[in-house]
Structure formats: structure tokens, C-alpha cells
């Protein structure tokens, strides 16, 4: 007996898709061996149609695939655009077709039911509306019009022109008789249920002269669209339910083991706490369609999702729905990165954001998730250098370390900065990730003056104190602008004896501006890093004023003033929308911080440090 298991019989109709799931013992060998789907021929040989090694036969090209889920011990064969020629005997298996472990599957593709001559077929999704057209002759114009449902050998009256309505159709059916001259009446049934499925008979008049017309109503359950996404990645559910429900509350729910559907998010403001910080319901288009984005996918997010419309914002029978079956692949291409980053008030964080390494030229963004109503994510910074005004001087997006990761640095942290942030690009939308910033108790490791006033033409020296744990880190000063933070030339003095022993007086890296010019005004960052990986930063604002007194100025932390006033957030905040993800230029207009002018450089700015050793770890 083979340990491989699957459906023994699969039946469907022409044009449909099937998704055949085969189970195998998830031993190490089985997980990594070849998986296949083959068709048994008259000779007994089994001809491969699709395999896990990428082979797809010409008969299956463009309509079939095989996906292995090694962590579950399953693989799934999807076959679309079925025809009656696909009917036959197949095997799903592991290893070699002729002697591997396998399971026999019978696939039967039928044409659909035989119907009486002249039957009109109406194929409609559950929850939608159907209009059945019923023609009649002139002599039956004044006579009773009716719609019957055929159940077995009997006919049950559904509605007639004498105002009878079958209780099963109450409040969702109407019979329309047009004005004179039009020899057709219509029956409109709203909010179709699966139980409405079947053969109907239109009738006008009675006796041998009556007009009859058969109608076959096929009410379809939504075929769940199979969605395969990577662990830690992102999924977008696009939901188009039709104009009939354009103004009705929308929802996305997940079907649970009790066969009810738990609301994940709806337009009435409800949201499942398990999706806090990682879900957005994008606004509806005029046609009532909307989309839901979920980032930071977890294994437990797997399952059947339904989107729908109902005034209660939750699933109700007879209202339109769309369905998806989400699978989360644990063998993810998306690298692990911290989902929580901690910082202290006044300190900083450096967040690593993954992106698809094949899209190194894509624009990178960072946005702040806001949970109000359906959720929104105003952009704070992007790789082209635009930064929200309130983040001026304390936020920067760096392309480093590159090769699938960029860095976002946020400093001068306050408790208001706690929350969820999204990393995204204008490329592969599946690589959106979420990180939560938490503000914890503690003191910043790097100490700089709060505010510095420099005098034109003089020398300015700004100290940055760091603790012993950063002794082996690379230290730097940079001048912040809305396009990044330009590193200033370093004048390291080399390791002194005092520094090697981490002497109190040696834990200092200083920035010298000589002579001070107008262009030197702005934000400066002192930071530590290790290669291309950034650690903590501290920011100081340098204001430049006219000469009042002679001599150079040394500013110590004791003389630090308050930081300059924060600018107010502009109202035209950019948000993630369907269109915007594809084309960031489609975001709403936004005020940007003007470039702060020439970078400090040349021999005028120098960084003094008692160390030139490389950085040795993360400051987080």
C-alpha cells in the first residue's frame, strides 16, 4: 500500500479548473524528491504532464502547475481550462513514474446537464442578480404571467402577476410586465442563493394556448482563487462585487473551523487584532470594487478568505461574495528581518527593509501604518529623497546594504514614534513588510548637544560621546538633507593607548567646521556603523549667525539648547493605494522639504576621533 494519498475521484465540467492535493509522509527524503503528475496510457506507462522540477508537457502549457509544500507533506496540481479530453486516469507521486510512491486519481470532465430544447441558461454567482426573460404571444397579453420552479416531476409557483410570492423568495423577487406592444415579461431575482439553482418555467396564459419558456438557473458558489504567497511577504485581495452593492458596507472575512466567517476587516471600522499593523482596506472605486492588503504573512494566516458586501459588514447568505484559498509557503524567498525594533526616547532606530533583489532600481518607500477606519499608510520617506516635513532632520532612507535590503534610520525618537511601519517599493508588491517600533525605557547611547549656534567665519567643534561598547564600531558624522545623509570627511587620529583601554576621555568623535559658512546651517548626525550596517545615530541642529565675538567656539553637551520647533505635518499626506503602489507618481500631491543646499565638504569639515577601528555590532 502506497503512503501517498489524494482524491480518488475528481469530477468537474468543461472550462473549469481543478486543484488536486496529494499527501506524502514528510520525511527529509520525500520533501526534496521529485513530485509528478502523470497520465496513464493504454500501455500502462504513465506519461509525465507536470513535475516539481519545472517540466510542463505541451498539452498542459500555460494551464497547469505543480507546487510543493514540503513543510506540510503535500503538493498541489492545478489544471485550468479543462476539456473533456482531460478525462482519464492519472497518478500523483514521488520519485520516478514507473517505480515511485504514487496514488491513482480518476478525473472526469463532463459537458454539463442535458436540458429541454429551447432552454435559456442563466449562469450567475451566488448573491448576484438574475433577470429571466419570458416571451409571450399577443393573445396571452392580458392573461396571468407566472414563474414556476421544477422540482422533480412537480412545478412550484415562485411568483405570478396576481401578487403571489413564494416565501422562499420574499423581498428579493419581482415580476415586471412592460407596456403594450412589448411581448416579454421579466422576473428579477436578487441576492441569489445556492438553493435557487435549478430549472424554471415561465408561463403566460393557461390551457393549450399558453406560452412556456424553460430557464436553467445555475447559481455558482465562488470558485476560490488559489493564492500562494511567501512567509513574511504580502498578499492583495482584489474584490469586485458589482455595482448593485457599490454603496453597501464591504468586508473581508476568514472562514473558521466552525464554518462561520470571522471579520478580518470591514468598512464599518472593524478589524481583527491579529492583523493589527499589517492590513489596509484600500478605498472603493466608483464600481464598488476594493482591495485588502495584508503584509508580514504568517503560517497561521492560511485559510479560506471571503470578501463580500452587507449592511452589517459581515457575511450573510444571499449576498455577493468572492473567495480565495491562501497558502503560505514556509520556504520563503523573503529573508527574515526583525518584526520589532526597540529604541529609547531621544535615541534612534535603524530598520532593515527587504526588497526583491532583482529590482535594485525600484523606488523604495517607508510609510506609517495608521489604524483609523480602514487603515492608511502615509509615506514618510522615499529613495528619491522626499521626506514628510515633520520628519525633517531625523529620518533617512539609505540604499545600503543593498542586494535586497535597504535601511531606514529614524532618530530623536519620542513615544509618538511607537507604531507600525511598512517597507515597500514600486516593484514587486509581495515584498511589502511590516516592522513595529517600540519605545522602551533607557538613555540614548550617543550624546550630542541639543542645539548649536555657530558663528560665520569661525571654527565650530561639535562633540559626540559614545559608550565603550561602540569602541570597535566605525564612527561617522554626516550632514542630513532630504536626499540622504552625506558623510563628512574623517580625520581619525588612530587608536591611542587611552582608547584601547576605553579611557573616559577617549570616547569621543568630534565634528569640526572651519570656517563656518551659511551653507553649514542644518542637521548633522553622529552615528556608528559596521560595514554597511547602520547602528545608532544622534542628531544636532546647527544654526548659523553673524559674527559677534572673536575666537573659536567649542560647544559641550552642557550648553545644549532645545531642538528647533517641529514643522506641522502637511495635510496632503500620501497614502498607499492600489494605483500608487504601481506608480508612485500617482500618489496625492505633497509638500516636500527643500534640499538643504551644498553639502559641507572639503577641508572645511573634519571629524576627529580617537579610533579608526571597524564597527563591531548592532546598537539595537
Amino acid at each position: 500500500k502506497s503512503p501517498v494519498f489524494g482524491p480518488q475521484e475528481v469530477s468537474s465540467v468543461e472550462g473549469n479548473s481543478v486543484s488536486i492535493k496529494c499527501y506524502y509522509p514528510p520525511t527529509s527524503v520525500n520533501r526534496h524528491t521529485r513530485k509528478y503528475w502523470c497520465r496513464k496510457g493504454a500501455s500502462g506507462r504513465c506519461i509525465t504532464l507536470v513535475s516539481s522540477e519545472g517540466y510542463v508537457s505541451s498539452n498542459y502549457a500555460g494551464r497547469a502547475n505543480l507546487t510543493n509544500f514540503p513543510e506540510n507533506g503535500t503538493f498541489v496540481v492545478n489544471i485550468a481550462q479543462l476539456s473533456r479530453d482531460d478525462s482519464g486516469h492519472y497518478k500523483c507521486g514521488l520519485g520516478i513514474n514507473s517505480r515511485g510512491l504514487s496514488f491513482d486519481v480518476s478525473l472526469e470532465v463532463s459537458q454539463g446537464p442535458e436540458l429541454p430544447n429551447g432552454t435559456e441558461v442563466y449562469t450567475v454567482d451566488v448573491g448576484r442578480t438574475v433577470t429571466i426573460k419570458c416571451p409571450f404571444k399577443t393573445e396571452n397579453a392580458p392573461k396571468t404571467k407566472a414563474l414556476y420552479k421544477k422540482i422533480g416531476q412537480t412545478s412550484v409557483l415562485v411568483i405570478d402577476s396576481r401578487n403571489y410570492v413564494n416565501p422562499n423568495y420574499k423581498d428579493r423577487i419581482r415580476l415586471r410586465i412592460p407596456g403594450t406592444g412589448q411581448l416579454i415579461f421579466t422576473v428579477v431575482i436578487d441576492r441569489l442563493r445556492l438553493s435557487d439553482h435549478g430549472l424554471y418555467l415561465c408561463q403566460a396564459g393557461d390551457g393549450s394556448n399558453r406560452d412556456e419558456k424553460n430557464a436553467d438557473l445555475q447559481v455558482l458558489e465562488p470558485e476560490p482563487e488559489l493564492v500562494y504567497e511567501d512567509l513574511r511577504g504580502s498578499v492583495t485581495f482584489h474584490c469586485a462585487l458589482g455595482l448593485e452593492v457599490a454603496n453597501v458596507a464591504k468586508f473581508l472575512c476568514r472562514v473558521n473551523s466552525r464554518e462561520t466567517c470571522d471579520v478580518v476587516i470591514n468598512t464599518l471600522g472593524k478589524r481583527d487584532s491579529a492583523f493589527e499593523g499589517r492590513i489596509l482596506l484600500n478605498p472603493q472605486d466608483k464600481d464598488g470594487s476594493f482591495s485588502v492588503v495584508i503584509t508580514g504573512l504568517r503560517k497561521e494566516d492560511e485559510g479560506r478568505y471571503l470578501c463580500g458586501a452587507h449592511s452589517d459588514g459581515q457575511l450573510q447568505e444571499g449576498w455577493p461574495i468572492q473567495a480565495w484559498q491562501l497558502f503560505v509557503n514556509e520556504e520563503s524567498t523573503i529573508p527574515r528581518s526583525p518584526t520589532v525594533v526597540k529604541g529609547v526616547a531621544g535615541g534612534s532606530v535603524a530598520v532593515l527593509c527587504p526588497y526583491n533583489p532583482k529590482e535594485s532600481q525600484s523606488l523604495k518607500y517607508w510609510c506609517l501604518w495608521e489604524g483609523a477606519q480602514n487603515g492608511r499608510c502615509p509615506l514618510l520617506v522615499e529613495s528619491q529623497g522626499l521626506v514628510q516635513e515633520q520628519y525633517e532632520g531625523r529620518l533617512s532612507l539609505l540604499q545600503e546594504p543593498g542586494n535586497g535590503t535597504f535601511t531606514v534610520i529614524l532618530n530623536q525618537l519620542t513615544t509618538q514614534d511607537a507604531g507600525f511601519y511598512w517597507c515597500l517599493t514600486n516593484g514587486d508588491t509581495r515584498w511589502r513588510t511590516t516592522v513595529e517600533i517600540k519605545i522602551i525605557e533607557g538613555e540614548p547611547n550617543l550624546k550630542v548637544p541639543g542645539n548649536v549656534t555657530a558663528v560665520l567665519g569661525e571654527t565650530l567643534n561639535i562633540p559626540c560621546h559614545f559608550p565603550c561598547k561602540f569602541s570597535s564600531y566605525e564612527k561617522y558624522w554626516c550632514k542630513w538633507s532630504n536626499t540622504g545623509c552625506q558623510t563628512l570627511p574623517s580625520q581619525d587620529e588612530g587608536p591611542s593607548e587611552a582608547f584601547v583601554n576605553c579611557d573616559e576621555n577617549s570616547r569621543l568623535v568630534s565634528l569640526t567646521l572651519n570656517p563656518v559658512t551659511r551653507a553649514d546651517e542644518g542637521w548633522y548626525w553622529c552615528g556608528v556603523k559596521q560595514g554597511h550596517f547602520y547602528g545608532e545615530t544622534a542628531a544636532v541642529y546647527v544654526a548659523v549667525e553673524e559674527k559677534k565675538v572673536a575666537g573659536s567656539r567649542y560647544v559641550s553637551p552642557a550648553k545644549a539648547d532645545a531642538a528647533p520647533d517641529e514643522k506641522v505635518l502637511d495635510s496632503g499626506v500620501r497614502e498607499i493605494e492600489n494605483k500608487a503602489i504601481q506608480d508612485p507618481r500617482l500618489f496625492a500631491e505633497e509638500k516636500v522639504v527643500a534640499d538643504t543646499g551644498d553639502q559641507a565638504g572639503g577641508s572645511r569639515a573634519s571629524v576627529d576621533s580617537s579610533s579608526s577601528e571597524e564597527q563591531g555590532g548592532s546598537s539595537k
Epitope: 475521484e9 468537474s12 499527501y23 473551523s257 464554518e259
Partner: nanobody, 126 residues
Amino acid sequence: EVQLVESGGGLVQAGDSLRLSCAASGRTFTTYVMGWFRQAPGKDREFVATITWSGSTNYKYYADPVKGRFTISRDNAKNTVYLQMNSLKPEDTAVYYCTSSTVVTDPRKLNEYAYWGQGTLVTVSS
């Protein structure tokens, strides 16, 4: 909630046939999986057959001991699933339970099913 009511059990001779029915009522519009498990006296409950569906596509799963003898089917309009049992053997004697769920990862695992009927007794005498 979903209610499941089994019927059709009884006493038959070895080699005879029997047809079990399971009618589902209540909130069945998200039900996509229905099946049968059985429990012989003094034994664990075991998988017999399951039918899962999606639109007009059906998938039928059977346990090895019943393959080729038992057939599972459903009537969508009546929210009913059937188990046609042919060539019955004494070892088929058990209480047969109908079960349903929205989605199951593995149809053979009984803990993946949300709802269970009270069971109907099938006795096959030799």
C-alpha cells in the same frame, strides 16, 4: 451552527448494500467538505470517505479498506451527502458518523472537522 442528521443504518447480511444519508441544516452556506467516519466497538474513530467541492468541481477521498465498494455523493439542492455501501463485510460493522467543515487540510484527520452528527449504527452479520 450546522446540524447533521444521519439515517439509513440497520442490520444487513454480508454482501448486501446499504445507503446512508446525512442531511445538513443551519448555516450551511460556507460548508465545502462533508464526509463519513466510523467507529467499531472498542476501536478508534476512523476515516471512511469525504467529498469536498468548489463550484461544480467535486473531490472524493476514500479510505483503503472501502475503496471500490463505497461511493460518496452529494445533493447540493438538498444539502445532503450520501454513502452508498456495497459488498458489505462484517468488519464494516460500526457506528457511522457524518461530519462537515469549511476547509480541511487533510480529509483523513478527524480533528479538522467542525461538526459531527449523532451517528447511525450499521451491523453486518455473516
